[in-house]
């Protein structure tokens, strides 16, 4: 189920400015989603929220080439990985000074993918083989999901596959940036 069908051998990471020297521990268990061993950058004020009742988690971005067998993407893609401990936004780091650091008790909250997007990838293959065109599934955003004790471990392994997408016929999610736009952004970053 979920992401078990994941097939990607990419390990070539392109560090981004201000990246973490090592990934948060949460990332290390998520090998079904990506095989990258490091990467990502600090979240943009992830715990600042207008709604204090909201639960927050981190969205880590990292850039890498993706591969399919011997073939590698002509250009890198920027991926997003959901990470971090979920907790009431008002009790996250800003509240440490007041001695109210949130500790999970009872229901468990996990940071999981909320929405997905596709990005076109051109794969270049060795030996004069023709290029391949594929669409890669990337996480578009993350959310905190409440997992009760009745949720089994497979859901955690599968990134909490209960993540919901808006009813697409009525309320489509914002248009994802095109592959070209993403690439332009990447190129400008170097």
């Amino acid at each position: 189920q979920g992401w078990q069908a994941f097939k990607n051998d990419a390990t070539e990471i392109i560090p981004e400015l201000g990246e973490y020297p090592e990934p948060p521990p949460e990332l290390e268990n998520n090998k079904t989603m990506n095989r990258a061993e490091n990467g990502g950058r600090p979240p943009h004020h992830p715990f600042e929220t207008k709604d204090v009742s909201e639960y927050s988690c981190r969205e880590l971005h990292f850039t890498r080439y993706v591969t399919d067998g011997p073939c590698r993407s002509a250009k890198p893609v920027t991926e997003l990985v959901c990470s971090g401990q979920c907790g009431p936004a008002r009790l996250l780091p800003n509240a440490i000074g007041r001695g109210k650091w949130w500790r999970p008790s009872g229901p468990d909250f996990r940071c999981i993918p909320d929405r997905y997007r596709a990005q076109r990838v051109q794969l270049l293959c060795p030996g004069g083989e023709a290029p391949r065109a594929r669409k890669v599934r990337l996480v578009a955003s993350c959310k905190c999901k409440r997992l009760t004790r009745f949720h089994n471990q497979s859901e955690l392994k599968d990134f909490g596959t209960e993540a919901a997408r808006p009813q697409k016929g009525r309320k489509p999610r914002p248009r994802a940036r095109s592959a070209k736009a993403n690439q332009a952004e990447l190129e400008n970053a170097y």
Partner: antibody, heavy 121, light 109 residues
Framework: EVQLVQSGAEVKKPGASVKVSCKVS????????MHWVRQAPGKGLEWMGG????????IYAQKFQGRVTMTEDTSTDTAYMELSSLRSEDTAVYYC??????????????WGQGTLVTVSS | QAVVTQEPSLTVSPGGTVTLTCGSS?????????PYWFQQKPGQAPRTLIS???DKHSWTPARFSGSLLGGKAALTLSGAQPEDEAEYYC?????????FGGGTKLTVL
């Protein structure tokens, strides 16, 4: 593995609407790209519309625009296709089809069993 | 809207080789059309054989292969079996829009 189970056959009168459901199991609907395809008796496959994960929106075939609505209930992992202003030429088997999940998008990998909609006065 | 064309019917001898093609009214078919090939037998739902030009699936027999040939998408069947007799459909992506071909009735005779 993704499995799709569609609602049963329907008989409708011209001018009426029909709503076909497609229940997903094995994955959650929010992970998948759902499309709808129909096939009139003795004819070929005809794409009606589906979710484009690159654009993040549902796209409808020009032919059906204004007459078809595709929605999803992620709480029950059920997709719906509603076709209005039915005419006799809408008599067909209606299929839902999704990608296989996983890292690479592979569309139309899993198909429902089909729902026969008969439009007759 | 684009029109996707296929041979209406083809015949192949058992053990023989046949190539089905899929053309586009808009011009040359490229990898950016992400050609798909489906097999459908009477009374059954379609079954995907090839995705993204040449990508086979776990259930796709090795005798089927996808490629681009002379500006069209192609499905080649090498070593035809009686059970390969079916209707074959191609599909092309035009951005987010999808268009099916009219289908090729393949007879193994």
């Amino acid at each position: 593995e993704v499995q799709l189970v569609q609602s049963g056959a329907e008989v409708k009168k011209p001018g009426a609407s029909v709503k076909v459901s497609c229940k997903v199991s094995g994955y959650t609907l929010s992970e998948l790209s759902m499309h709808w395809v129909r096939q009139a008796p003795g004819k070929g496959l005809e794409w009606m519309g589906g979710f484009d994960p690159e654009g993040g929106e549902t796209i409808y075939a020009q032919k059906f625009q204004g007459r078809v609505t595709m929605t999803e209930d992620t709480s029950t992992d059920t997709a719906y296709m509603e076709l209005s202003s039915l005419r006799s030429e809408d008599t067909a088997v209606y299929y839902c089809a999704t990608d296989a999940g996983g890292y690479w998008y592979k569309f139309f990998q899993h198909w429902g069993q089909g729902t026969l909609v008969t439009v007759s006065s | 809207q684009a029109v996707v064309t296929q041979e209406p019917s083809l015949t192949v001898s058992p053990g023989g080789t046949v190539t089905l093609t899929c053309g586009s009214s808009t011009g040359t078919v490229t990898i950016d059309h992400y050609p798909y090939w489906f097999q459908q037998k009477p009374g059954q739902a379609p079954r995907t054989l090839i995705s993204d030009t040449d990508d086979k699936h776990s259930w796709t027999p090795a005798r089927f292969s996808g490629s681009l040939l002379g500006g069209k998408a192609a499905l080649t069947l090498s070593g035809a079996q009686p059970e390969d007799e079916a209707e074959y459909y191609c599909l092309l992506f035009y951005g987010g829009t999808v268009v099916f071909g009219g289908g090729t009735k393949l007879t193994v005779l």
